[in-house]
Interface confidence: low
């Protein structure tokens, strides 16, 4: 072979990644590398990773002389150390008025009263701790419950009975029920008063109401 | 180039006290962790604890805790060690060393804390 | 706590002879993400330790490669296949897998 084929060690460099190659003999080489790299020819790059040094269940990504942690979403910072604060990041996470309450790893919510769920998005069943009398049926409402009640019941709970059932009030009287007591109340025509409509009034008067 | 430069030697009595820096150069601070391991005499290093430099989180070998706390100085790329309670056999180097491959890879030169009354 | 035990404590090998020091650790260091955190360090007096071998196998940055470590589980091995007398040291295997980090007792290599 000429001489202008001689091998020199440096040339071109054999190292890669930045490396800085230095002749070290005839045929012999050295190559200084960049931090981060390894190897004869500086080929590999080093594993930074620092297995249990990234916190909270994040997953270590190696990188050129360092290396990042890949969070869960509850965490973040370097070493997901750092708790993203849900409540900033999303305003809308807490519904119907529910309040939001940062926490470490998380968020919670404080629901208004009717409403449950992570996210007070479910409306509490309030029939499930109704006292309706039975026979009669309750109506879930938020944060409440009502009872309708079957012919002859009446009251906040259907516990009552309706005093309206005997027809009490005359001349074409409305009957209602008291839904406390119980007790009927006539709405009289026009020129009927007293507790039954039996009485006649003034053409002047009108629309008495009587409770018994 | 990596450097982690400790403060000097400490002669503590039993009962007091001792803070130990290390000035960490040639890289990210924030990027790595600081651990503190301690050497007697003789015996081998014994992993102490550890500090987060970009949020402060610490973690302590159980037998250090109640004891050991560490703090860090980001302006200035420093770490803090320090021993409260210090007993006879806490004579011992103290070294840092920084984290990478879930090993120790770069470590300060040591700092000779002797507790003797 | 995970114990580490060398073997054996000291070691004298003639200079360019092969030494061979040993660990065991008292569970498997397999660690969940799959890796085995377990880790080779060199000594010598007045100095702190220095990574040698990394993740059983990997040879940390300027490490001369007569430096070689092997093993899984619970058994590793440093091997030095040619001791030159700069190697005169205490040699400390580490492992990071379970907290707390613990070293083993230290192998001292001397030359015969």
């Known amino acids: 072979a000429g001489s202008d084929s001689l091998y020199v060690p440096c040339a071109p460099s054999p190292c890669v990644n930045g490396g800085t190659c230095r002749q070290t003999g005839d045929f012999t080489f050295e190559c200084n590398c960049l931090p981060g790299f390894e190897g004869s020819t500086c080929e590999r790059n080093i594993d930074d990773c620092p297995n249990h040094r990234c916190q909270n269940g994040g997953v270590c990504v190696d990188g050129v002389n360092t290396y990042n942690c890949r969070c869960p979403p509850q965490w973040t910072g370097q070493f997901c150390t750092e708790d993203v604060d849900e409540c900033l990041l999303q305003p809308n996470a807490c519904q119907n008025g529910g309040t939001c309450a940062n926490r470490n790893g998380g968020y919670g919510c404080v629901c208004v009263n009717g409403w449950s769920g992570d996210d007070c998005s479910e409306n509490i069943d309030d029939c499930a701790f109704a006292s309706c009398t039975p026979g009669s049926t309750c109506i879930d409402r938020v944060a409440s419950f009502s009872c309708m009640c079957p012919e002859g019941k009446a009251g906040l709970l259907c516990h009552l009975d309706d005093a309206c059932i005997s027809n009490p009030c005359h001349k074409g009287a409305l009957c209602d029920t008291n839904p406390l007591n119980g007790q009927y109340i006539c709405t009289c025509p026009q020129g009927y008063k007293g507790a039954d409509c039996t009485e006649d009034v003034d053409e002047g008067n009108s629309h008495h109401h009587h409770h018994h | 180039e990596v450097q982690l430069v400790q403060s000097g030697a400490e002669v503590k009595k039993p009962g007091a006290s001792v803070k130990v820096s290390c000035k960490a150069s040639?890289?990210?601070?924030?990027?790595?962790?600081i651990h503190w391991v301690r050497q007697a005499p003789g015996q081998g290093p014994e992993w102490t604890g550890y500090i987060i430099p970009g949020s402060g989180g610490t973690k302590f070998n159980e037998k250090f805790k109640g004891r050991a706390t560490s703090t860090v100085d980001t302006s200035i790329t420093t770490a803090y060690m320090e021993l409260s309670r210090l007993r006879s056999d806490d004579t011992v180097v103290y070294y840092c060393?920084?984290?990478?491959?879930?090993?120790?890879?770069?470590w300060g030169q040591g700092t000779l804390v002797t507790v003797s009354s | 706590d995970i114990v580490m035990t060398q073997s054996p404590d000291s070691l004298a090998v003639s200079l360019g002879e092969r030494a061979t020091i040993n660990c065991r650790s008292s569970?498997?260091?397999?660690?969940?993400?799959?890796?085995?955190?377990l880790h080779w360090y060199q000594q010598k007096p007045g100095q702190p330790p220095k990574l040698l071998i990394y993740?059983?196998?990997n040879r940390f940055s300027g490490v001369p490669d007569r430096f070689s470590g092997s093993g899984s589980g619970t058994d590793f091995t440093l091997t030095i296949s040619s001791l030159q007398a700069e190697d005169v040291a205490v040699y400390y295997c580490?492992?990071?897998?379970?907290?707390?980090?613990?070293f083993g007792g230290g192998t001292k290599v001397e030359i015969k």
């Open positions: 569970q498997s260091l397999v660690h969940s993400d799959g890796n085995t955190y």
């Open positions: 993740r059983i196998s």
């Open positions: 040639g890289y990210t601070f924030s990027n790595y962790v």
């Open positions: 580490l492992q990071s897998t379970h907290f707390p980090d613990t």
């Open positions: 060393a920084r984290d990478g491959a879930g090993s120790f890879t770069y």
